[in-house]
């Protein structure tokens, strides 16, 4: 029961962790202006994985999408490149998963292959979480870099009476989303790998076998043996669940900005 | 079609207060950012104050700051302006105006004069 | 707060003239994000309203002849008017929208010869 626990829990919070990196790879504020210490404007910038926008205070909203793919810096390509994998390895490993829940039944699925399955995609979700989290991490290295590059010029052009302010971008919403949802996927696939450990045949029963010798009444019962090959084929004692299976199909796609609204 | 009546001027005397009012009709008042400008006699344009579509920020000029207040009546439609404390520099005709694209004033209502005088 | 700095403060001219005033700002009015300058000019004749003739330094707003070009980047911007007519008569202001507080020029008074 506690094993069915784990892995369900397991499939829930990395289910959860990759709808939230597939919102923070959609989201547009990866880097929002920083309001600090700066005149107040009557525009507010921020920036995506795929567009920047600009919000006026007249309450229009302008995004514009990168239609260019080489002359995007290196690193912004790099996040792209982490928050796909990840995305495109939760994705797979949630499919996996499925098949490998405990409280769903497909055929004659053994328990050693939904084991082998419960472990695939419990690597899966730790290494998609960690493409996550280091995506939206180089992202946020690389906003602190620029962050303190553009305080130590704030004003160029200081020569002359002009002043030319220059905008500085902080982290935006999608670094905590993508933050708190890489941890989720990464312990969502912690409680997977947890979860294959006892769903791993432990024991092969053997029934007993009476042996009786002549003019003595005395019935031999050898003992079980314990299993130690972990996953081993265990045709004997199958336990069917017939738990009802959970569709989970409230992923939620974050709301995209309009190009002019 | 877009049209903005101000209405409320008057002659006020100094440090008395007056509120006046913008009846807006072909949008609602609720979805725009609203200001209110003025313009002293035979003088330029000066901006007063700001309301956002969410009514949240809201911005004065330094001159009319803590003396006036920009507010809203969604259902009756309308942009207010409160002014308390009032200044003889205050005499102006005053202004109401949409915000559009690019932050700018697409919508002005014909304005209304408020004299400040003893 | 932003200085507008409008020039010349009046221009007589003559129908079908070519007519170019100025506006300079104290601070850069091009926003990063969208390399966009937040600059409007208005048009204001005698007893009436101002109205809206270009916003973004050079995106005319709909129903303005074309005769009326908005030009510039940064802190400087022009206003042209190819040919002006005797409709054109008016006061011109320009005006800062992209800091608080909204600052107006003082404006350039347009008269006829």
């Known amino acids: 029961m506690a094993v069915t626990a784990c892995q369900g829990l397991g499939f829930v919070v990395s289910l959860i962790g990759i709808a939230g990196i597939i919102a923070a790879t959609c989201m547009d504020q990866w880097s929002t202006q920083d309001l600090y210490n700066n005149p107040v404007t009557a525009v507010f910038n921020y920036q995506g994985l795929w567009r920047s926008c600009v919000r006026e205070s007249s309450g229009f909203t302008e995004c514009r999408g990168y239609f260019t793919l080489l002359g995007l810096p290196a690193m912004l390509q790099a996040v792209r490149a982490l928050m796909i994998v990840g995305i495109v390895l939760g994705a797979i490993g949630l499919l996996v998963s499925i098949f490998a829940l405990k409280c769903i039944r497909i055929g004659s699925m053994e328990d050693s292959a939904k084991a082998n399955m419960t472990l695939t995609s419990g690597i899966m979700f730790i290494v998609s979480g960690l493409c996550a989290i280091a995506g939206v991490s180089v992202f946020a290295n690389m906003l602190v870099t620029n962050f303190w590059m553009s305080t130590a010029n704030m004003y160029t052009g200081m020569g002359g009476m002009v002043q030319t302010v220059q905008t500085r971008y902080t982290f935006g919403a999608a670094l905590f989303v993508g933050w708190v949802a890489g941890g989720l996927t990464l312990i969502g696939g912690v409680m997977m790998c947890i979860a294959c450990r006892g769903l791993a045949p432990e024991e092969t029963n053997y029934k007993a076998v009476s042996y009786h010798a002549s003019g003595h009444s005395v019935a031999y019962k050898p003992g079980g043996f314990k299993a130690s090959t972990g996953f081993g084929s265990n045709t004997k004692n199958k336990k069917i669940y017939d738990g009802g299976a959970r569709t989970e199909d409230e992923v939620q796609s974050y709301p995209s900005k309009h190009d002019y609204v | 079609d877009v049209q903005l009546v101000e209405s409320g001027g008057g002659l006020v005397q100094p440090g008395g207060s007056r509120k006046l009012s913008c009846a807006a009709s072909?949008?609602?008042?609720?979805?725009?950012?609203m200001h209110w400008v003025r313009q002293a006699p035979e003088k330029g344009l000066e901006w007063v104050a700001y309301i956002s579509s969410g009514s949240s920020p809201i911005y004065y000029a330094d001159t009319v700051k803590g003396r006036f207040t920009i507010s809203r009546d969604n259902p009756k439609n309308t942009l207010f302006l409160q002014m308390t404390s009032l200044r003889s520099e205050d005499t102006a005709i005053y202004f109401c105006?949409?915000?559009?694209?690019?932050?700018?004033?697409?919508?002005w209502g014909q304005g209304t004069l408020v004299t400040v005088s003893a | 707060d932003i200085v507008m700095t409008q020039s010349p403060s009046s221009l007589t001219v003559t129908t079908g003239e070519k007519v170019t005033m100025s506006c300079k700002s104290s601070?850069?009015?091009?926003?990063?994000?969208?390399?966009?300058?937040?600059l409007t000019w208005y048009q204001q004749k005698p007893g009436q309203s101002p109205k809206l003739l270009i916003y973004?330094?050079?995106t005319r707003e709909s129903g303005v002849p074309d005769r009326f070009t908005g030009s510039g980047s940064g802190t400087d911007f022009t206003l042209t008017i190819s040919s002006v007519q005797t409709e054109d008569l008016a006061v011109y202001f320009c005006q800062n929208n992209y800091f608080f507080p909204l600052t107006f020029g003082a404006g350039t008074k347009l008269e006829l010869k």
């Open positions: 072909g949008f609602t008042v609720s979805s725009f950012g």
């Open positions: 601070q850069s009015l091009l926003n990063s994000g969208n390399q966009k300058n937040y």
């Open positions: 105006a949409r915000f559009y694209y690019g932050n700018s004033f697409d919508h």
């Open positions: 973004w330094a050079s």
